[in-house]
Interface confidence: medium
């Protein structure tokens, strides 16, 4: 069966300066390929986090994505700013040259509240 990317929260609200967790789980690790988080959709979407060796300030993975059986690809965004508001998508790719997007979560909208 085709892999599903599940983002159970439709939205989260977070006060500026606080941190928030965006949940994402997969039903399978196959096909082999990376999982990435984006804000927005289409050509203008912004890469927020990739579960590889890259370093992303203020964004960390919640569980150990290097474990073979791990299906949790949730992320934590720290020190949230108003600029972080938007809809975040957890996206599964199939490895290739280039990688091919095969499934996206339904999106989680982040609302940033003034402190």
């Amino acid at each position: 069966t085709e892999v599903k990317v599940i983002q159970p929260e439709k939205s989260v609200s977070v006060a500026a300066g606080d941190s928030t967790v965006l949940n994402c789980t997969l039903t399978s690790l196959l096909p082999v390929g990376p999982i990435r988080w984006y804000r927005g959709v289409g050509q203008s979407r912004q890469l927020i986090y990739s579960f590889t060796t890259e370093h992303f300030p203020r964004v960390t993975n919640v569980s150990d994505a290097t474990k073979r059986s791990n299906l949790d690809f949730s992320i934590r965004i720290s020190n949230v700013t108003p600029e972080d508001a938007g809809t975040y998508y957890c996206v599964k790719f199939q490895r290739g040259s280039p990688d091919t997007e095969i499934q996206s979560g339904g999106g989680t909208e982040v609302y940033v509240l003034a402190k």
Partner: antibody, heavy 119, light 108 residues
Framework: DVQLVESGGGVVRPGESLRLSCAAS????????MNWVRQAPGEGLEWVSL????????YYADSVKGRFTISRDNSKNTLYLQMNSLRAEDTAVYYC????????????WGLGTLVTVSS | ETVLTQSPGTLSLSPGERATLNCRAS??????LAWYQERPGQAPRLLIY???TRATGIPDRFSGSGSGTEFTLTISSLESDDFAVYYC??????????FGGGTKVEIK
């Protein structure tokens, strides 16, 4: 107080059409995803369809896909379900249900409207 | 699609007794599970969400527990208004949203 009032139910023959309405009040209608859920006589609850607050995102249960169309008019605070090619197994009470703003469970329900499909 | 199985189908109890209703998911839904009450001629009512959080205005004799695939709704001391049909619903997976088949709590 949130109020959801369904209307448009009735008795129709197989193959015919019916349009259900749900008039909403007591909340900012356009900010909430809305659903139709049905209950056949003596049976459990069955989710039918979902529409996002803006109307851009729509889902259907496999059992109604291609026959039913969900829509909304945010200026009238009204949710609709256009039901075509009705079958005997569509006989049920149809409930309009308001989703929670963060998760896909249902905070508020209407009393329902009965649709009977019979020859 | 996540299938929810409720047991028992019918529970015959007397007022004042404790009711224990079960809901089993075919795959983990974590804590993304809600419980509803349906009385004849009334709109279904949200009782519990997040597996264990009572909805606004729900009396504390109703409690929910469990996570993953096994969930329980407990009514600590049944009152006359509590004799009804109860449904669980998962909202972890994207639509289709699924309900259990229901448990009827009837007067013994």
């Amino acid at each position: 107080d949130v109020q959801l009032v369904e209307s448009g139910g009735g008795v129709v023959r197989p193959g015919e059409s019916l349009r259900l309405s749900c008039a909403a009040s007591g909340f900012t209608f356009s900010s909430y995803d809305m659903n139709w859920v049905r209950q056949a006589p003596g049976e459990g609850l069955e989710w039918v369809s979902l529409i996002s607050g803006s109307g851009e995102i729509i889902y259907y249960a496999d059992s109604v896909k291609g026959r039913f169309t969900i829509s909304r008019d945010n200026s009238k605070n009204t949710l609709y379900l256009q039901m075509n090619s009705l079958r005997a197994e569509d006989t049920a009470v149809y409930y309009c249900a308001k989703e929670n703003n963060r998760y896909r469970f249902f905070d508020d329900w209407g009393l329902g409207t009965l649709v009977t499909v019979s020859s | 699609e996540t299938v929810l199985t409720q047991s028992p189908g019918t529970l015959s109890l007397s007022p004042g007794e404790r009711a224990t209703l079960n809901c089993r998911a075919s795959q983990s839904v974590y804590s993304y599970l809600a419980w509803y009450q349906e009385r004849p001629g009334q709109a279904p009512r949200l009782l519990i969400y997040g597996a264990s959080t009572r909805a606004t205005g729900i009396p504390d004799r109703f409690s929910g527990s469990g996570s993953g695939t096994e969930f329980t709704l407990t009514i600590s001391s049944l009152e006359s208004d509590d004799f009804a049909v109860y449904y669980c619903q998962q909202y972890y997976d994207r639509p289709p949203l699924t309900f259990g088949g229901g448990t009827k709590v009837e007067i013994k």
